[in-house]
């Protein structure tokens, strides 16, 4: 009842709590002398469902049969209406419509850790829409039964709050959950388990790693576990990898030797635990331990290449270049490179440690036979030295690769192809393809790139340090013993017409012809490999088509003679440059009048 109901009563039959789809009878009756004064026959009793009138009757009582009530709570209120007055509330009642609980499903229990508490979960099934009490019951050895009740509205979890101990780890316990409300009850199927089944160990903690004698091959992982743990599984991976290595161990007692770790690598380690070979569940993975393995001496050998440059009649400049070892070969932080230069006949040797670069330049006499050895050193030792005899790499004309071509191959790649040299092709031990950005001054500071190719290959795809719209000088060397031959070509991965033409800086008269000198187009405006220059000229005030002279591009050329100008005529001259993609806009215009006689 929802208020004091002084004037009358509302009764509900068969009950205030009904099964969905049931019918209820609601009776509203006035108490004696509580009707309308003087006009008791005029009593009008009205029944409201929430705020909606559903029935009325004149007299001292009203009966109403109600069907089709929805799930949940419905409020009925009975009011009295008298003539010339407001309706007076008599009494009311709430009716609760629901269903009996369904059988709870999938009951499962777990204890997190040997000191944890037992908690069980289940699926309630559909909502009953009524207050439903759940009782979790556990039957165990010694004829004991533990139980706990759930006070939550939607109960699908209960924690007993106490701990199952391993005193008889194989003893059976049986759990069951029972749901009860006003319309019925239902129990889950029993779930039977032992201590070993439901205890999920805590993840291992205090994980440490030790390297005996700072060696990666003598590595032990240590951790702490709960006392009853029998099995562990370890997983580890380099920090930059997504794939784990897995190891299962039995009776490890908190330690395990790892034999396959790579040196100088940061690893992530995690451990999980289990109490029994085939019962129970694995713990969560432990927190990660991150640790770097110690260095080992480098393996592998440096890839070394060199350039020779003539200085004068007695001296030459040698520039050595080498590539970093891969991480797996370096096996540590490379502290320095050791370069040894030796004159083979006289036996003089010079050793130098290089830090921070992968190149070295020195000047040596042009006479004698010279060799270099280069090795990489970390804190544990040095790589095997790479030995190279310094020779004239392009001396043997018969070893020069033939028909060298360079073609763009997709974005920032150049495909270099060649034919074997005329001399016995089987004499070639390897090819080296070398490339560097083309700088008109032949700048030796420009980085050098190279790759090695097996003697049976006649092509190489170069992609390292290749930029679009840059021209590269590409050389292919064929090496055979202490001899080498080479051929070169210019190539680019992507090209377009140059952004500007050459700048004419001088025009001079020489014996009836003129010599035009120009400044090279800045590298960043060439937009690829230049194929030709064009020199245009026409008479100053003429509308005729200009004449032109096309000159094949050569790196070092910065002047060209023209001998077809008429004397005492003023000409306008300008230049353009061409790549395979087209011609530049023209450069500056210069006027010139030839003073002498025509040839």
């Amino acid at each position: 009842k929802i208020d004091a109901c002084k004037r009358g009563d509302v009764t509900v039959k068969p009950s205030h709590v009904i099964l969905l789809g049931s019918t209820v009878n609601i009776t509203c009756s006035l108490k004696p002398r509580q009707g309308c004064f003087h006009y008791s026959r005029r009593n009008k009793l009205i029944l409201y469902k929430f705020d909606r009138r559903i029935n009325f009757h004149h007299g001292h009582s009203l009966n109403s049969q109600v069907t089709g009530l929805p799930l949940g709570t419905t409020l009925f209120v009975c009011k009295l209406a008298c003539i010339n007055s407001d309706e007076i509330q008599i009494c009311g009642a709430e009716i609760f419509v629901g269903v009996a609980p369904e059988q709870p499903q999938n009951l499962s229990c777990i204890q997190k850790g040997e000191q944890g508490t037992v908690a069980c979960t289940w699926e309630r099934g559909r909502d009953t829409h009524l207050y439903t009490e759940y009782t979790l019951q556990l039957s165990g050895p010694k004829n004991l039964t533990w139980q706990k009740q759930c006070k939550d509205i939607y109960c699908d979890y209960l924690d007993f709050g106490i701990n199952l101990t391993p005193e008889s780890p194989e003893s059976n316990f049986t759990a069951k959950v029972t749901a009860v409300n006003s319309l019925g009850s239902s129990s889950s199927l029993p779930s039977t388990f032992t201590f070993l089944d439901i205890v999920r160990p805590l993840p291992p903690w205090d994980i440490r790693i030790k390297f005996q004698k700072a060696s990666v091959s003598r590595c032990t992982l240590y951790w702490r576990d709960e006392g009853l743990v029998l099995l562990n599984r370890l997983r580890y991976r380099p920090s930059n990898s997504r794939l784990w290595n897995m190891v299962n161990v039995t009776k490890a007692k908190g330690r395990h030797d790892l034999l396959d770790l790579k040196p100088f690598t940061e690893y992530e380690f995690q451990i999980s635990s289990k109490l029994h070979l085939y019962k129970g569940s694995w713990s969560d993975w432990s927190e990660s331990l991150r640790a770097q393995t110690p260095e080992e001496e480098p393996t592998g050998m440096l890839d070394v290449w060199y350039m020779k440059r003539h200085i004068d009649y007695s001296r030459q400049q040698i520039s050595l270049f080498w590539k970093n070892l891969s991480v797996s070969e370096a096996r540590g932080k490379i502290l320095h490179y050791q370069v040894t230069l030796q004159e083979l006949t006289g036996g003089k040797a010079m050793t130098q440690n290089i830090t921070g670069h992968t190149s070295w330049t020195t000047v040596i006499p042009r006479t004698g036979n010279w060799a270099v050895a280069v090795s990489a050193a970390n804190s544990k030792g040095s790589s095997l030295p790479t030995r190279i005899n310094i020779m004239n790499l392009c001396e043997a004309g018969l070893l020069a690769p033939r028909q060298v071509s360079a073609n763009s191959e997709g974005m920032d790649n150049i495909l270099v192809t060649w034919q074997p040299p005329r001399k016995d092709p089987s004499a070639v031990q390897e090819y080296v393809v070398e490339w560097r950005e083309l700088h008109p001054g032949g700048d030796t500071q420009v980085p050098l790139n190279w790759l090695r190719s097996r003697p049976y290959n006649v092509s190489a795809l170069i992609s390292e340090n290749i930029k679009s719209y840059i021209c590269y000088e590409i050389r292919v060397y064929a090496l055979s013993g202490d001899q080498g031959g080479c051929s070169s070509i210019l190539g680019n991965s992507k090209h377009k017409a140059p952004l500007s033409g050459p700048h004419i800086n001088a025009i001079t008269e020489e014996k009836g012809s003129i010599l035009i000198s120009w400044n090279s187009i800045p590298v960043q405006e060439q937009m690829g490999c230049l194929l030709h220059y064009r020199i245009y000229w026409k008479e100053r005030d003429s509308n005729s088509q200009p004449q032109l002279c096309e000159i094949p591009y050569r790196v070092s050329q910065n002047s060209h003679p023209i001998n077809s100008l008429q004397p005492r005529v003023t000409y306008v001259l300008w230049m353009t440059a061409l790549t395979a993609a087209g011609e530049s806009s023209h450069g500056n215009e210069r006027e010139f009048c030839l003073q002498g006689k025509a040839n």
Partner: nanobody, 125 residues
């Protein structure tokens, strides 16, 4: 100083009911496991019922359904409601208290630190 005082014992006909009370002073009942044990003449003390601090209850199957343990935190007291009493329920009933956190420990008398003096229950046929 911790004290446990039982009351509510007496004589009753078979099939009757009794409600035993255990008033506790010096400790809070909701922080401890509370137990009831009984000892019949010439027999060992046996476990009857217990409630953990987390309100998990435990009963031997022999009394389950006839006996209910409950506690009133406000009154700092524990109760044992006994229905459908049988002559074999005749014994001295003891209230006990201890910091027990295990399932098995709730039914073990050596896990309880504090004990009352006991109250006599006699069931006649």
């Amino acid at each position: 100083q911790v004290q446990l005082q039982e009351s509510g014992g007496g004589s009753v006909q078979a099939g009757g009911s009794l409600r035993l009370s255990c008033a506790v002073s010096g400790r809070t009942v909701s922080d401890y496991a509370m137990g009831w044990f009984r000892q019949a003449p010439g027999k060992e003390r046996e476990f009857v019922a217990a409630m953990s601090s987390s309100e998990t209850t435990v009963y031997p199957n022999s009394v389950k359904g006839r006996i209910t343990i409950s506690r009133d935190n406000a009154k700092n007291a524990v109760y044992l409601q006994m229905n459908a009493l049988k002559p074999e329920d005749t014994a001295v009933y003891y209230c006990s208290m201890g910091p027990i956190v295990t399932f098995q420990g709730l039914a073990r008398q050596n896990e309880y630190h504090y004990w009352g003096q006991g109250t006599q229950v006699t069931v006649s046929s």
